[in-house]
Interface confidence: low
């Protein structure tokens, strides 16, 4: 079931989504919020944590296909571990090889999410807008 | 409460959103779905109607601020009535003056939604992706 449905059969089952923090976006039982205040990566992470959420984690092109539509650039929860060279999410999981196209425009250890599943490497101290995500149980 | 929160106070009230058709986006109790199959305006309208929804109606920058983030161009439910010159939604209501920036790039009687509350006039017979919307009661 894609956000970009080719043709949806009817009748469609009506269902509730969530629970999410009030006025967050709910999609396939994940909660998302876009924050327009520019913060560096660490401040963005702290802001999400303060709301019982984390910076965006991209884990599935199917479950998160709404991210195809997002314009502009926003901090996500992906960081480069200089000691071993890997890209990891905040929860310590390794970035799957086919989820994001990583584009190294800048030297840095953090990444900005851009539409169509692209990640732009950026200096973690640069202020940017950010996306928080809360996975429902 | 804006999608672009400057800073969200905690604790946030957790709530369910909907009900919506399965796997649609739910935001502020409205349901949205983006369709990647290109159709002309009339076919897009029929597709939304077949799912008990309508083409996107923009009625509030506050309640629909997620639309700021949408990239690309998609049919919405706005049509030009040539006999009297007005722009109306499918439900017959007139377009409020400060909701959309209408840009006449083409001659036509239908409109494409583009990010940041812009509407591009287009020939209704041109195929485009489209946005369906269902307002919850």
């Amino acid at each position: 079931n894609s956000l970009f449905n080719q043709e949806v059969q009817i009748p469609l089952t009506e269902s509730y989504c969530g629970p999410c923090p009030k006025n967050w976006i709910c999609y396939k039982n994940n909660c998302y919020q876009f924050f327009n205040e520019s913060k560096n990566w660490y401040e963005s992470q702290a802001s999400c944590m303060s709301q019982n959420a984390s910076l965006l984690k991209v884990y599935s092109k199917e479950d998160q296909d709404l991210l195809k539509l997002v314009k502009s650039y926003h901090w996500m929860g992906l960081v480069h571990i200089p000691t071993n060279g890997s890209w990891q999410w905040e929860d310590g999981s390794i970035l799957s090889p086919n989820l994001l196209t990583i584009i190294e425009m800048q030297k840095g250890d953090c990444a900005l999410y851009a539409s169509s599943f692209k990640g732009y490497i950026e200096n973690c101290s640069i202020p940017n807008t950010y996306i928080c995500m809360q996975r429902t149980v | 409460n804006s999608l672009f929160n400057q800073e969200v106070q905690i604790p946030l009230t957790e709530s369910y959103c909907g009900p919506c058709p399965k796997n649609w986006i739910c935001y502020k109790n409205n349901c949205y779905q983006f369709f990647n199959e290109s159709k002309n305006w009339y076919e897009s309208q029929a597709s939304c109607m077949s799912q008990n929804a309508s083409l996107l109606k923009v009625y509030s920058k506050e309640d629909q601020d997620l639309l700021k983030l949408v990239k690309s161009y998609h049919w919405m439910g706005l049509v030009h009535i040539p006999t009297n010159g007005s722009w109306q939604w499918e439900d017959g209501s007139i377009l409020s003056p400060n909701l959309l920036t209408i840009i006449e790039m083409q001659k036509g009687d239908c409109a494409l939604y583009a990010s940041s509350f812009k509407g591009y006039i287009e020939n209704c017979s041109i195929p485009n992706t489209y946005i369906c919307m269902q307002r919850t009661v």
Epitope: - | H80, I94, T101, I103, E104
Partner: antibody, heavy 121, light 107 residues
């Protein structure tokens, strides 16, 4: 023929009020956002606000501050601008305008002839 | 509010000259820009809408271009009836705002 005919201007003392009106003919008044623009002598154009002929919905410039009120009479196809607490700074030519069919409410292809308001003691 | 800055404020030109007037918006207005001509004692007259679309009945010597924040009105060959004041207007968002005007005078 599509036309806007303005009436009402004149000389008024500071603190006074005036009602300017604009009568539409040759098109369906109900479907347009009728707009008011003013121009002080030797100066540029300044948008005041607009009112929808059918619904009566209104939008004003922020500087208006409640001193100006837009109204309309559907039966008479007339849009009016009530101006209160007038000062010398309000001395201007006042125009009503109608948007083009396809350009919606922000591009004006039909204008009234203008009506002069002079505020002086 | 979006500020519109027009330049020059006045210019002198001769019949047959190519005349260019510029208008700069304080923020991106997405091509939603109009140009009007106004003659003394008359109401403005729409020349160009949506930055580059020629209004019906307007001579083809008038053209508009631009995007983002910067826009230009060009008169390819100035005619006697073109001596007037020209205004740009942003049609992107309320409140609608106009440039200060450019007076085109006979040299």
């Amino acid at each position: 023929q599509e036309q806007l005919e303005q009436s009402g201007g004149g000389l008024v003392t500071p603190g006074g009020s005036l009602k300017l009106c604009c009568t539409a003919s040759g098109f369906d008044f109900n479907t347009f956002w009728m707009t008011w623009v003013r121009q002080a002598p030797g100066k540029g154009l300044e948008w005041i606000g607009c009112i929808h002929g059918g619904s009566g919905s209104r939008d004003y410039a922020s500087w208006v501050n409640g001193r100006f009120t837009l109204s309309r009479d559907i039966d008479q196809s007339t849009a009016c601008l009530q101006v209160n607490s007038l000062t010398a700074a309000d001395t201007a030519m006042y125009y009503c305008a109608r948007p083009g069919y396809r350009s919606w409410s922000k591009t004006f292809d039909l204008w009234g002839q203008g009506t002069m308001v002079t505020v002086s003691s | 509010d979006i500020q519109m800055t027009q330049s020059p404020s006045s210019l002198s030109a001769s019949v047959g000259d190519r005349v260019t007037i510029t208008c700069r918006a304080s923020q991106d207005i997405s091509g939603a820009l109009n140009w009007y001509q106004q003659k003394p004692g008359k109401a403005p007259n729409l020349l160009i809408y949506a930055a580059s679309s020629l209004q019906s009945g307007v001579p083809s010597r008038f053209s508009g271009s631009g995007s983002g924040t910067d826009y230009t009105l060009t008169i390819s060959s100035l005619q006697p009836e073109d001596f007037a004041t020209y205004y740009c207007q942003q049609a992107n968002s309320f409140p609608l705002t106009f440039g200060g005007g450019t007076k085109v005078e006979i040299k």
